[in-house]
């Protein structure tokens, strides 16, 4: 089992204009559906919804962010406009480098993810769940612009910072 | 097509440890939970843990301090031991499969297990 | 932790509807899966029912799921019941990575 290594950092914007970094570490699993590979961009939440909707204008991103796509509990959404897999590989169509899932409300999707290893993505696709994706969910529940690197080992101390 | 077989020892001493290995063909291991699940002679069906596709385990808390769950992958087994065997163990025992929603798609034929000295 | 609840045996005639019932003892019926399994004497079970009202491949489509939401309970209802439904049916959910299991019902056709 292939421990995914996450750090994300989030910029907060000072009075001055200067840009004040926190990062955190924390730990996921790259799963079946997509490559055991490093990546970084942008951090973009996305709503399991949002990646229903299957207009093509509806790239508003540049290539190479991070889609972080918290699951519900499966009864809230008893008829998916797609799997979870589906939803991974749209984020990937749409721009995405990777795609981090939070699974503590549909644990169940861990499974439907390593069933993805017939046809899997050429990007990673990780999910997070317990202590870790809260962690996650409560820098990007900030709405602030945060970065998130994901490593398949774990990273150099001291931690490198991004180069903006 | 998809099967899952258990064995292990019929009689068990009681304080012993129960060993059962649980043969799986038709699917991987790691795309889909093995589950374990006894049925006593009453009736009843009470889940025991689960090995997740990313070979994590879940417990019963009922049974947390003395089960434990692994696997091999290579040869397509997963592993019951539960240690400190009493009468009331004795049931018959299955392996079952999920794989991504919260139901058991696939179940093996079961063992009867005798906890008697 | 909740609790399902299902009448220990039911006795229903040849030709006839039975509805066997599941009840949750707290929280909502509707907020986790429930599923249905048949059994033969001595044999394993097989899924029947599953997601409440989901009828896997190869069963007869005289068995449905429901929700009854007036006594938290979910219902596996036997339409045109025939001598080979004689079975135990046990129903079965979870709840934070813990599956649970009702007691089971025997049926028995007359």
């Known amino acids: 089992k292939e421990t995914a290594f996450v750090e994300v950092v989030l910029f907060e914007s000072s009075p001055s204009g200067d840009y004040t970094t926190y990062t955190t570490g924390l730990t996921g699993r790259f799963s079946r559906a997509g490559a055991t590979l490093s990546a970084e961009g942008e951090i973009v939440q996305m709503h399991p919804l949002g990646l229903c909707n299957n207009n093509d204008e509806e790239d508003l991103y540049e290539y190479g962010w991070v889609g972080v796509v918290k699951l519900e509990q499966p009864e809230l959404d008893p008829k998916p406009c797609l799997t979870v897999l589906g939803k991974a590989k749209r984020a990937v169509q749409r721009g995405a480098t990777a795609v981090i899932f939070d699974v503590s409300e549909n644990p169940e999707a861990i499974d439907q993810l390593n069933q993805g290893s017939e046809d899997p993505l050429k990007r990673p696709v990780v999910y997070v769940k317990g202590a870790d994706a809260i962690k996650l969910m409560n820098i990007v529940n900030k709405q602030k612009v945060a970065r998130a690197r994901i490593q398949h080992r774990p990273p150099r101390q001291p931690t490198e910072y991004f180069d903006m | 097509q998809v099967q899952l077989k258990e064995s292990g020892p019929g009689l068990v001493q009681p304080s012993q440890t129960l060993s059962l290995t649980c043969t799986v063909s038709?699917?991987?291991?790691?795309?889909?939970?093995v589950h374990w699940v006894r049925q006593h002679s009453g009736k009843s069906l009470e889940w025991m843990g689960r090995?997740?596709?990313?070979?994590?385990?879940s417990y019963n808390s009922a049974f947390t301090s003395r089960l434990s769950i692994s696997r091999d992958t290579s040869k397509s087994q997963v592993f019951l031991k539960m240690n400190s065997l009493q009468t009331e163990d004795t049931g018959t025992y299955y392996c079952?499969?999920?794989?991504?929603?919260?139901?058991?798609?696939?179940w093996g034929q079961g063992v009867m297990v005798t906890v008697s000295s | 932790q909740f609790v399902l609840t299902q009448s220990n045996s039911v006795s229903t005639n040849l030709g006839s509807t039975v509805k066997l019932s599941c009840e949750r003892s707290?929280?909502?019926?509707?907020?986790?899966?429930v599923n249905w399994y048949q059994q033969y004497e001595g044999r394993s079970p097989t899924t029947m029912i599953y997601?409440?009202?989901?009828?896997p491949d190869g069963v007869p489509d005289r068995f449905s799921g429901s929700i009854d939401r007036s006594s938290n309970s979910v219902l596996l209802t036997i339409n045109n019941v025939q001598t080979e439904d004689e079975a135990d049916y046990f129903c079965?959910?979870?709840?934070?990575?813990?599956?649970?299991f009702g007691g089971g019902t025997k049926l028995t056709v007359l």
């Open positions: 079965q959910s979870y709840s934070s990575d813990m599956y649970i």
């Open positions: 079952d499969r999920s794989g991504g929603s919260p139901f058991f798609d696939y």
């Open positions: 038709g699917f991987s291991l790691t795309s889909y939970s």
């Open positions: 997601k409440f009202d989901q009828r």
């Open positions: 707290i929280g909502n019926i509707g907020s986790n899966y």
């Open positions: 090995i997740w596709s990313d070979g994590d385990t």
